[in-house]
């Protein structure tokens, strides 16, 4: 499919001008190659009319130009003094006319309307309001006022001052007679339809002395704004319909076959399943304007979108609308990244988030998509050191691996973590990606004890058991804080006995805290990585307490550690042996910190998008 994009149809009137914008992927080659505008012949050729290399056909001499905007990836063809002879099929393209790097454009130039003398022309957008002003003389001040529409050869009454309203205009038309001082009546028609276009006649009086005024009403279907975005990127539709519809329900719909327009999202809470997790409706301003952001763009998202206002929250005749034609460029600069990441309860996920590598200094964000109100993605963590309180100790954003990718690690997973998350930066707004976390059946791969209590001044050893599947991975311990996870020295204690059917390649790696101080209290993670790519992690909370009196020491230690096989050594060296690996009490499946999460978050269920781009918690 050609990555060149432009307007499918351009309509104008004789004598007028048109400006046609064509989009191309702004690669170095494309920016500098020849741009052209050619007319398609009956036998399939395409005759160049103008090109970026200076050629201008004699038919266009003095009335056309072609301007390239390489920084935007667009070029613009302006054609003036249009005639009906200019109607036809054209191509805008790059390179050689026959190469296929082009887009088909249909240009239709119509004859200007043959208007009667003294005709006032009203040009109004579809769905809007028109006020037709009708002057009259004093002698007709008390006489009947009326508005007719010319249908074929006959005028048909639309409204009059005796209270008649044509059924086609019911509920959306009124006739106002100005105060006595002004010799003027006006007809206001709301929610204009395409069928309202035509010639009107307003009249005051019914005899030969009546005052008449001709009006030509042109109802314009909005020209779609062309939007060119990359596959996997995002698009923002800014919809400004005016303050008169500020309090009316808003919608964004996508035109399917014919006149159907399927609601994508609306302010009444409707959302199309295909956009679950990747659409946000920004709440409207006081003037009624709003915006819709769609991320993770797919090929099938291309098409015509309309935004509008109607109490039903969907397109109806007479809805004021704005239109866009979205083209999704498959020659995308945005790298593929998994759209689904799977983890198990008690386990972890490591999510890779792409960003524009030119913006390495931008702030990186990770937020939780909330479908309920269509418009929220509350921040969970950023690259500046902020972590939402309920996620302390189990969430970290790392700038690694860098060069266009950052990593988010979330551990101590529970079913409530299932849902959609967005990766954002405060730089290029087109780089927003969505990932769905799914919680699947299974056991965490890394085995650590439950929460641990250390004693001031003593030495603490905490084990982490790695199965053989991680034999080739680097194993580490680190101390979590809100800016990341600071690496700590650890000891490889040899093969682990924690895994059935696992050979000598399994490993027990211990963290040792010597001469424990109050500052050692906090969350510790053990994990695996390959270079700058992170895999699974497991978290342990280490509490620090004063040494107890000798008589009560053993009991309280066993309780505090929730580790029944812990040995307390006379030397003041405490080792958590953790032999009873199958004992569920040893593992932080759902720690207290997970239970304290904001109840307002509610329960989030995952929606399977059926994506083929899935990754497990430990793969990359």
């Amino acid at each position: 499919k050609s990555p060149i994009f432009g307007p499918e149809e351009v309509n104008s009137v004789e004598g007028n001008s048109v400006s046609i914008t064509c989009y191309y992927p702004p690669t170095s080659v494309n920016r500098h190659t020849r741009k052209y505008w050619c007319r398609q012949g009956a036998r399939g050729g395409c005759i160049t009319l103008i090109s970026s290399e200076g050629y201008v056909s004699s038919k266009y001499a003095g009335r056309a130009n072609l301007t390239n905007f390489p920084e935007n990836g667009t070029f613009v063809v302006n054609i003036a003094q249009l005639s009906q002879d200019d109607s036809g099929r054209y191509k805008c393209g790059l390179g050689i006319n026959s190469r296929g790097l082009s887009f088909d454009v249909s240009l239709e130039v119509s004859q200007g309307p043959g208007l009667l003398n003294d005709t006032k022309v009203y040009t109004v957008d579809l769905g809007r309001t028109v006020t037709i002003n009708c002057p009259f003389k004093t002698e007709n001040a008390q006489k009947r006022k009326s508005l007719y529409k010319q249908i074929g050869l006959y005028p048909v009454l639309v409204i009059d001052s005796s209270g008649y309203v044509n059924p086609n205009y019911t509920g959306r038309i009124r006739l106002d007679i100005q105060g006595t001082g002004q010799l003027l009546f006006s007809v206001v028609i709301n929610q204009l339809r395409l069928s309202d276009a035509g010639q009107y006649l307003c009249q005051a009086g019914d005899d030969s002395n009546s005052n008449k005024k001709n009006a030509d009403l042109q109802v314009l279907k909005p020209e779609p704004e062309l939007v060119y975005e990359d596959l996997r990127g995002s698009v923002t539709f800014h919809c400004a319909l005016g303050p008169e519809v500020a309090n009316v329900a808003k919608f964004l719909c996508r035109q399917s076959s014919g006149e159907n327009c399927d609601v994508v999202v609306n302010t009444l809470g409707k959302r199309a399943p295909a956009f679950e997790g990747r659409i946000l409706l920004n709440p409207q301003d006081k003037d009624g304007s709003f915006s819709v952001v769609i991320t993770g763009l797919r090929k099938e998202d291309a098409g015509r979108y309309l935004c509008g206002a109607h109490s039903d929250g969907q397109l109806q005749e007479g809805s004021p609308i704005q239109a866009w034609q979205l083209f999704v460029n498959e020659e995308s600069t945005i790298p593929r990244s998994p759209t689904v990441v799977k983890g198990v309860a008690g386990g972890s996920v490591a999510v890779l988030c792409p960003y524009n590598r030119k913006e390495s200094k931008s702030i990186k964000y990770w937020c939780l998509w909330e479908g309920a109100q269509n418009g929220r993605c509350p921040l969970l963590v950023d690259s500046e050191g902020w972590v939402k309180a309920q996620y302390e100790g189990r969430l970290s954003l790392l700038e690694e691996p860098g060069n266009g990718t950052f990593t988010v690690i979330l551990n101590q997973l529970t079913s409530r973590d299932a849902g959609f998350y967005w990766c954002l930066t405060n730089g290029d707004t087109l780089w927003r990606t969505t990932v769905e976390i799914k919680i699947i059946e299974g056991e965490p791969n890394l085995k650590v004890p439950g929460n641990v209590t250390a004693v001031l001044g003593e030495t603490l050893k905490v084990p982490c058991h790695f199965p053989c599947k991680f034999s080739s991975y680097e194993k580490y311990w680190c101390k979590w804080n809100n800016t990341g996870c600071q690496a700590l020295p650890s000891q490889d204690e040899g093969p682990s006995k924690a895994f059935v059917n696992c050979d000598e390649n399994s490993r027990l790696v211990s963290l040792t805290l010597n001469l424990v101080t109050r500052a050692d209290e906090g969350w510790y993670w053990c994990g695996v990585k390959q270079g700058h790519f992170y895999g699974e992690t497991a978290a342990v909370y280490v509490a620090v307490e004063e040494r107890k009196a000798a008589g009560s020491r053993d009991v309280s230690l066993a309780k505090a550690d929730a580790a029944p096989d812990e040995k307390v050594l006379d030397s003041g060296f405490r080792e958590i042996e953790n032999k009873a690996i199958q004992d569920p009490r040893l593992f932080a499946e759902e720690k207290a910190v997970a239970d304290t999460r904001d109840q307002a978050d509610g329960s989030r269920a995952s929606v399977d998008s059926g994506s083929s781009e899935e990754q497990g918690g430990s793969s990359r």
Epitope: L280, N282, P283, V293, Y365, C367, G375, R376, C377, P378, L379, D382, E384, G385, W386, V387, K388, A389, L424, N426, T429, N482, T483
Partner: nanobody, 131 residues
């Protein structure tokens, strides 16, 4: 909701120092940025300094760079503005402001220097610098 109470304002000579404090209470777990703004009589409210509540990154208006220092004490939910080498042009009412963590996509675009980014405001404390 978050409540903010400023203190430390007063009347000083040009060249002197002053330290303003702003204590936050309420739902402080949602704090994202804390900032100081000032407003002189008949003037618009203007940005002075801001601090990121998580990592502590600081932002300053050009007019106060090198003279004013913003800092925070997360444990006390308090932000400070240390003002050195004060000038008569620093005379104004100083307001403490707090910003919630972003929730809407537009929030992510807002900068700590923007007055519209902040959700909560204190009553202000007067600083007068005489020459």
């Amino acid at each position: 909701q978050v409540q903010l109470v400023e203190s430390g304002g007063g009347l000083v000579q040009a060249g002197d120092s002053l330290r303003l404090s702003c204590a936050a209470s309420g739902r402080t777990s949602s704090l994202y940025n804390m900032g100081w703004f000032r407003q002189a009589p008949g003037q618009e409210r203007e940005f002075v300094a801001a601090i990121h509540w998580g990592g502590g990154r600081t932002y300053y208006a050009d007019s106060v760079k090198g003279r004013f220092t913003i800092s925070r004490d997360n444990a006390k939910n308090t932000v400070y503005l240390q003002m050195n080498s004060l000038e008569p042009g620093d005379t104004a009412n100083y307001y403490c402001a707090a910003r919630r963590a972003p929730e809407l996509l537009d929030d992510y675009k807002q900068k700590p220097e923007e007055i519209g980014a902040y959700h909560y405001w204190g009553q202000g404390t007067q600083v007068t610098v005489s020459s």
